[in-house]
C-alpha cells in the first residue's frame, strides 16, 4: 500500500501510554451539512414498523444525549392500517462509539466506549420453527 | 442530594484550550457484552425492505471501517415475495461520532467529527402529492 509519512507537526507521542491515550479536540466538525434534508424525516410514523423515540441521558457520557428507538408494535402495520402479527417489528441496532468520563466526573479525561443503540425499526418475516 | 466532588485524580485542566481538547483512552470498553446475539442478525435479508451492507473505509478516521446500508429496492417486498412499488424502502440514518486524525496522519491527535450513516432500511407509506 501507499506509505503516508507521519506529519512532522504531530503532537509529541513519547508518552508512556502512547498510543492508547490520545488528544481529542471536541470542537465537532460536521460532515452532514450538505446531506439530504429528507434524512430528518417522519419515517418513524410512516413505517409499517413504526417506532417511538426516547431520550437516553447519561451525563458521564459524551454525547450525554442519545435518542433511542422503541418499536410500537410486535407486529407490522398492514395495508388496512391494522397490526399484522404474522410479521414482526424489530429494532435495527447499531454499535456506536461514545466517550465515557474516566475517572468519573472528570471534565477533560475520557475513555472510548462502544454502546448499542436502536436507531429505528424494520418489518421482518418471522422465523418459523416447525415442531416434528 | 449526595455531593460528588470532582475526582482529585483528574488530569490537569489548565490547558488554554480546556475543555475543547481532552485526553481519551483508546482502550475501548464494550458495554454490549450481554446484549442479545440476535442483534448481528439476518434482518437485512428478512426485512420487507431488505438492504445490502457496504464497507466504507477511511484510514484517517477512527474507526476506519464503517458498514453502510443501501436499500435493495425502491419498493417493499409483499407477501408474495414481489416488490410492491406502492410502498417505499427508505434508509434509516443516524448521526454518529468518529475521530478524525488532525493534523492528518498523526497517530495520537484527533478531532471529533459527526457523520451520517445508513444503518438499515424500513418500509414506509409514500407521501402522495395530489395535483389540483
Amino acid at each position: 500500500g501507499i506509505t503516508i509519512p507521519r506529519n512532522p507537526g504531530c503532537p509529541n507521542s513519547e508518552d508512556k501510554n502512547f498510543p492508547r491515550t490520545v488528544m481529542v479536540n471536541l470542537n465537532i466538525h460536521n460532515r452532514n451539512t450538505n446531506t439530504n434534508p429528507k434524512r430528518s424525516s417522519d419515517y418513524y410514523n410512516r413505517s409499517t414498523s413504526p417506532w417511538n423515540l426516547h431520550r437516553n441521558e447519561d451525563p458521564e457520557r459524551y454525547p450525554s444525549v442519545i435518542w433511542e428507538a422503541k418499536c410500537r408494535h410486535l407486529g407490522c402495520i398492514n395495508a388496512d392500517g391494522n397490526v399484522d402479527y404474522h410479521m414482526n417489528s424489530v429494532p435495527i441496532q447499531q454499535e456506536i462509539l461514545v466517550l465515557r468520563r474516566e475517572p468519573p466526573h472528570c471534565p477533560n479525561s475520557f475513555r472510548l466506549e462502544k454502546i448499542l443503540v436502536s436507531v429505528g425499526c424494520t418489518c421482518v418475516t418471522p422465523i418459523v420453527h416447525h415442531v416434528a | 442530594g449526595i455531593t460528588i466532588p470532582r475526582n482529585p485524580g483528574c488530569p490537569n485542566s489548565e490547558d488554554k484550550n480546556f475543555p475543547r481538547t481532552v485526553m481519551v483512552n483508546l482502550n475501548i470498553h464494550n458495554r454490549n457484552t450481554n446484549t442479545n446475539p440476535k442483534r448481528s442478525s439476518d434482518y437485512y435479508n428478512r426485512s420487507t425492505s431488505p438492504w445490502n451492507l457496504h464497507r466504507n473505509e477511511d484510514p484517517e478516521r477512527y474507526p476506519s471501517v464503517i458498514w453502510e446500508a443501501k436499500c435493495r429496492h425502491l419498493g417493499c417486498i409483499n407477501a408474495d415475495g414481489n416488490v410492491d412499488y406502492h410502498m417505499n424502502s427508505v434508509p434509516i440514518q443516524q448521526e454518529i461520532l468518529v475521530l478524525r486524525r488532525e493534523p492528518p496522519h498523526c497517530p495520537n491527535s484527533f478531532r471529533l467529527e459527526k457523520i451520517l450513516v445508513s444503518v438499515g432500511c424500513t418500509c414506509v407509506t409514500p407521501i402522495v402529492h395530489h395535483v389540483a
Partner: antibody, heavy 119, light 107 residues
Framework: QVQLQQSGAELVRPGASVKLSCKAL????????FHWVKQTPVHGLEWIGV????????AYNQNFRDKATLTADKSSSTAYMELSSLTSEDSGVYYC????????????WGQGTALTVSS | NIVMTQSPSSLSASVGDRVTITCKAS??????VGWFQQKPGKSPKLLIY???NRYTGVPSRFSGSGSGTDFTFTISSLQPEDFATYFC?????????FGQGTKLEIK
C-alpha cells in the same frame, strides 16, 4: 442569522387550552433539540421539556407532564407547545430555546410569550 | 432534581467594580453549567457555557470558573450595560435547573 420567533401574548380563561408557537429561522430546524422554559417571579426559570424535530422524540419534566404537549412541524420549521386545563398558576412567560445536543448548552432563545390566565 | 443555589440574590455595585456571583449545585454537575444575563422584558442571553467558556461575542470582562459543585461568575469591571439579572443553570442532567437569579443594581 439564527432567530427563534415566538407567538404573541395570550389572555385565556381558566380551564381552556392554548397553543404557543416558536418559528426557527437561519438554520436547519431538524438538527437541534427545542426546549421550553417557563418563567415566573415566584418560581424563576423552570424547564418544561424537549422535542427533537428531526426524530419526533419528546421528554418532559415530571412537573409538566400532564400540562404541556410538545409538537413540531418540519414544513414550517415551527415548534409548538400546547398547555391544557389552564389555571392562574400557569400564568408566566414561556420561552423556547435551542439546545446543542453534542455541545450541551442552550444558545439561542425566543423573545418569550406572556401567558395570562384570568377570568 | 439538582438544585442550583445562587448567591447573592441581589447586589449593588458601581461602574468599574469587580463583581462575583456564586452558584452551588446540590450534587456534582462536572462542568455542565452555563451563565445567562437577562434584562427586563427580554429573554436570557448566554454568556458562559461549560463553566468557563465565553460564548461567541461575549466581552472578556465576563468569566466563569469551577467544576463539580461550586461555580463562580465574575465581571471584572462593570459597565453601564451590565446592570441586569444573572442566572446559573445546569445541563448535566434533566430536568435542567436554574439558580434563582442575582439582580445586579447600580449603587
Amino acid at each position: 442569522q439564527v432567530q427563534l420567533q415566538q407567538s404573541g401574548a395570550e389572555l385565556v380563561r381558566p380551564g381552556a387550552s392554548v397553543k404557543l408557537s416558536c418559528k426557527a429561522l437561519g438554520y436547519t430546524f431538524t438538527d437541534y433539540e427545542f426546549h421550553w422554559v417557563k418563567q415566573t417571579p415566584v418560581h424563576g426559570l423552570e424547564w418544561i421539556g424537549v422535542i427533537h424535530p428531526g426524530n419526533g422524540g419528546t421528554a418532559y419534566n415530571q412537573n409538566f407532564r400532564d400540562k404541556a404537549t410538545l409538537t413540531a412541524d418540519k414544513s414550517s420549521s415551527t415548534a409548538y407547545m400546547e398547555l391544557s386545563s389552564l389555571t392562574s398558576e400557569d400564568s408566566g412567560v414561556y420561552y423556547c430555546t435551542r439546545f446543542l445536543t453534542y455541545e450541551g448548552y442552550f444558545d439561542y432563545w425566543g423573545q418569550g410569550t406572556a401567558l395570562t390566565v384570568s377570568s | 432534581n439538582i438544585v442550583m443555589t445562587q448567591s447573592p440574590s441581589s447586589l449593588s455595585a458601581s461602574v468599574g467594580d469587580r463583581v462575583t456571583i456564586t452558584c452551588k449545585a446540590s450534587q456534582s454537575v462536572s462542568i455542565d453549567v452555563g451563565w445567562f444575563q437577562q434584562k427586563p422584558g427580554k429573554s436570557p442571553k448566554l454568556l458562559i457555557y461549560h463553566a468557563s467558556n465565553r460564548y461567541t461575542g461575549v466581552p472578556s470582562r465576563f468569566s466563569g470558573s469551577g467544576s463539580g459543585t461550586d461555580f463562580t461568575f465574575t465581571i471584572s469591571s462593570l459597565q453601564p450595560e451590565d446592570f441586569a439579572t444573572y442566572f446559573c443553570q445546569q445541563d448535566y442532567s434533566s430536568p435542567y435547573t436554574f439558580g434563582q437569579g442575582t439582580k445586579l443594581e447600580i449603587k
